[in-house]
């Protein structure tokens, strides 16, 4: 853009250098050149000479008019054609921007991920504004009436150390830019009700070699929360539909869940938990893939366990190699079963 330019005159914009997208805009150029009575004044947008809607107001001033200006940014400058000069002479330049006032932030959610030491608040920002937009997060104690404010761009992490004086808060978000301000709805937060247990991990799975083979899935969490309610969803990799099993979990020991599954099929498992009776779920765990054994009961497969996966990581595939002598093939399989895509709470889907 044109940040610092030595002007030999002035350039100004009506209604202003930042305006609402779709507005009609007039840009004025006034020369103050020494030893020049310009024959013509020219306007350039992003380096290209403009041909239309230019009016010469008087000897020193011209105007260009744009109907429904809809570009987020443009670099304008104007020049003079001075008699006896081969080149045009620069008069002045301006950066101009158009955008929208912000939408009211919606779907405000605040959670505390266990052990994080922060309350994380997120919201939907609405349609793009195209101009600098800030979000002011207000956190007001319902017990002490003290209010804190935090500046954010799309989410905020507030240290729980600064939320020591109270358990109940009112949280809301203001979206601010030079074209306007909008408030979210207020969210009532009780710190004890928004804790999400530490990530749940499926560590391994095995299929027994019984007459009716059963698959045992082992899963764990480092949570200190005593009463935890969990869901495990599972499906074959070829299926679109998930089956869901529910569990009350006690993570003082590794959880074992039993499934009677189709033989010789590749299954995907994911687990998520919440504190019993609360509303905030963990995101689904990374998908764990397990191959059930053939009906004959021959165990020509090797379960391969998941590494530790952080809550926000992308999908990690689990594969079972046909033979332990084919490591290269195994690696290729692991790279092609799943494309990693970001976890997004309840909406993460596989397959």
């Amino acid at each position: 853009g044109i940040t610092s330019i030595n002007c030999s005159g002035d350039m100004w914009v009506e209604p202003g250098e930042i305006f609402q997208m779709g507005m009609n805009v007039s840009i004025y150029c006034q020369e103050a050149l020494k030893h020049c009575r310009p024959r013509n004044l020219y306007f350039y947008k992003n380096g290209f000479k403009e041909e239309f809607d230019i009016t010469r107001i008087n000897r020193t001033t011209a105007r260009i008019w744009y109907k429904g200006f809809s570009e987020p940014h443009a670099y304008m400058h104007c020049t003079a054609e001075c008699p006896g000069h081969f080149q045009e002479t620069l008069i002045c330049g301006k950066d101009i921007s158009s955008g929208h006032p912000p939408d009211a932030p919606s779907n405000l959610t605040c959670v505390i991920y266990e052990y994080s030491g922060n309350m994380t608040c997120t919201w939907n920002t609405g349609k793009p504004t195209y101009i600098d937009t800030k979000y002011i997060v207000h956190v007001k104690s319902l017990e002490t009436e003290e209010e804190q404010q935090y500046l954010a761009s799309s989410y905020v992490k507030i240290s729980t150390d600064s939320l020591q004086g109270s358990r109940k808060y009112l949280v809301w978000v203001q979206a601010v830019n030079s074209l306007g301000m909008e408030n979210s709805q207020q969210l009532h937060v009780h710190l004890d009700d928004i804790v999400i247990p530490s990530a749940s991990i499926i560590s391994r799975a095995e299929t027994t070699n019984d007459t009716v083979p059963k698959t045992i899935v082992y899963w764990k969490s480092k949570t200190m929360i005593e009463k935890v309610f969990c869901e495990m969803r599972y499906k074959t990799t070829t299926n679109q539909t998930w089956s869901v099993k529910e569990f009350d979990a006690n993570f003082t020991y590794v959880q074992q869940s039993e499934f009677y599954l189709e033989p010789d099929s590749k299954y995907v498992f994911q687990v998520r938990c919440q504190e019993t009776g609360k509303r905030n779920w963990q995101p689904w765990s990374s998908p764990f893939v397990h191959q059930t054994s053939q009906e004959t009961g021959k165990r020509n497969w090797q379960p391969w366990s998941s590494p530790f996966v952080h809550q926000t990581s992308q999908t990690v595939s689990q594969v079972t190699a046909k033979s332990s002598h084919e490591p290269q093939k195994m690696e290729m399989l692991s790279a092609t079963i799943f494309r990693g895509h970001p976890a997004s709470g309840n909406h993460q889907d596989i397959g």
Epitope: E17, I18, S97, I131, D132, K134, I136, Q148, Q149, Y150, L151, A152, S153, V156, K157, I158, S162, V176, N177, S178
Partner: nanobody, 116 residues
């Protein structure tokens, strides 16, 4: 840590003018998004004006066309020129330094009283 000190408040008749100043000290001032806020008795602390990162300025609807935010970088000082003051502009005025993800830091405030 930034310290902020407001001045320039006072009592004025409706239609009058005041110019508030806010002097900042501390080495993190350059990362501040500076704003002016006001709090009337029993009300929330509301944003009046804020300098945006793209060089533009936000003004609350209630002060548009009457208040002007300016800054003097060499002096680490921001100003709020308040013209055509109304009784409803009566409040404690604060300047604030906001940095992304951090708690907004306020000055002590300066009282503005507009009588009719």
């Amino acid at each position: 840590q930034v310290q902020l000190q407001e001045s320039g408040g006072g009592s004025v008749q409706a239609g009058g003018s005041l110019r508030l100043s806010c002097a900042a000290s501390g080495d993190t001032y350059s990362s501040c998004t500076m704003g002016w806020y006001r709090q009337a008795p029993g009300k929330e602390r509301d944003l009046v004006s804020m300098l945006m990162g793209d060089g533009s300025t936000f003004y609350a609807d209630s002060v548009k066309g009457r208040f002007t935010f300016s800054q003097e970088n060499a002096k680490n000082t921001v100003y709020l020129q308040m013209n055509s003051l109304k009784p409803e502009d009566t409040a404690m005025y604060y300047c604030g330094c906001a940095t992304l993800g951090s708690r907004t830091i306020w000055g002590q405030g300066t009282q503005v009283t507009v009588s009719s």
